[in-house]
């Protein structure tokens, strides 16, 4: 956090995670200043000479930008006056992980804050009833994870039960040779029960729920990024 006072403004960053191969956002906010031309935003990365991005006098200045970020960054220009200095990052790579600094200078003063950016892969799981199996089973699939996650099953009826003996999990490397497809099969399931497939690594936690009854199958999935926040 920046130090409040005559020459310092408060700058706030949020630890966030990037999904490789997709757009990412490095979040940073500051005390707003209506004088756009007086606002300078600089993004720096620890261990990198040159800037990640610079925005000043109402426009981008990439004259000092490091080559690894060329054509991959942009601020949300229309939101700068309201105190948004967040950076959009194109095609997130594993090598983008690290410590970033959001440095702000306005007519009110200056300030900076650090941000820890994690990169990996995470995706929503989908659970389906596997009718091909000899006994009723559930198949939980998630297309992209990295680093390799842990997979656990739970059930509403048998709370606290250990399903490791009646499940089989495999990790299949995807075509880009980094991320992996996660497939987990749970055997001997009973109807009128809700089962959960939980996939977790140090970046994200995803849960897929399925409720199987005589008349219908209900599904729900959710994804939560870990350690994200100020």
């Amino acid at each position: 956090f920046g130090i409040s006072g005559k020459h310092f403004i408060t700058v706030t960053t949020f630890t966030s995670a990037g999904n490789i191969g997709e757009d990412g956002t490095l979040s940073c906010t500051f005390e707003p200043d209506i004088k756009l031309n007086g606002i300078v935003i600089q993004w720096l990365k620890e261990g990198i000479k040159g800037l990640v991005h610079e925005f000043k006098e109402g426009k981008d200045d990439l004259s000092q930008q490091h080559e690894m970020f060329r054509g991959r960054t942009a601020v949300f220009a229309d939101q700068v006056v309201v105190g948004n200095a967040s950076l959009r990052l194109k095609n997130v790579q594993l090598t983008d992980a690290g410590t970033y600094t959001c440095y702000i200078r306005t007519s009110k003063g200056k300030g900076n804050a650090n941000l820890e950016y994690k990169t990996g892969a995470f995706s929503m799981p989908e659970i389906n009833v596997d009718y091909n199996a000899s006994s009723e089973s559930l198949r939980c699939e998630a297309p992209r994870w990295f680093p390799q996650p842990t997979v656990a099953w739970a059930s509403q009826v048998d709370q606290g039960a250990n399903f490791s003996e009646v499940s089989n999990t495999s990790f299949e490397l995807n075509s880009e040779n980094v991320t992996m497809k996660v497939v987990s099969v749970l055997y001997n399931v009973t109807i009128n029960n809700t089962y959960s497939c939980m996939i977790e690594n140090d970046i994200a936690k995803a849960t897929g729920d399925i409720k199987v009854t005589d008349s219908e199958v209900k599904r729900r999935s959710q994804l939560q990024l870990l350690n994200s926040g100020p």
């Epitope: 060329r70 054509g71 960054t73 942009a74 959009r88 194109k90 992209r144 075509s175 880009e176």
Partner: antibody
Amino acid sequence: EVQLVQSGAEVKKPGASVKVSCKASGYTFTSYWIGWVRQAPGQGLEWIGDIYPGGGYTNYNEKFKGRVTITRDTSTSTAYLELSSLRSEDTAVYYCARLDGSSYRGAMDSWGQGTLVTVSS
Amino acid sequence: DIQMTQSPSSLSASVGDRVTITCKASQGFNKYVAWYQQKPGKAPKLLIYYTSTLQPGVPSRFSGSGSGRDYTLTISSLQPEDFATYYCLQYGDLLYAFGQGTKVEIK
């Protein structure tokens, strides 16, 4: 409204060079990448390269390296494509296009009307 | 460099048909695939970017999907004005690349 207006048709002899211009208006010229794409008669689209007018940074298709130069003049908000050592297979319509996303190189969202370059002896 | 292999190269369809065009990337994973429509003598028009985001003003019968190396453009109910050539574009790599194009003709 974003507008890209290209220079007129050109007829060139094999071995010569051609320089096609693309004048931009309706947005901040230095803030968005501009790309060049060509299309030979009856053929598909082929990406040539692009430039960031705010810094003059360029990217080129390996196929054209050494023969193509993309430049810009910020005072007139104009981008240029120069292709040298022309051969008959360079006969095509050449398009300029603005890339979406400002300093972020996005997809091409606004296009010029195209410039026909004919290479013939 | 990432190449895009588009199929089919041409197809015949009738008004009201559901049409699907695919592009396969030679390597890697990224969501940076756009789709363009081009009519004879005209510049290409952006329909979809970032795999599935519809460009403003483009009818909702156009949709994009895909993951990994496989990407798809779908026209849910073909209209007379949709007969044209369609191209995919890979723009995640430093070097951009178009697919070879798919000509959609009237059956």
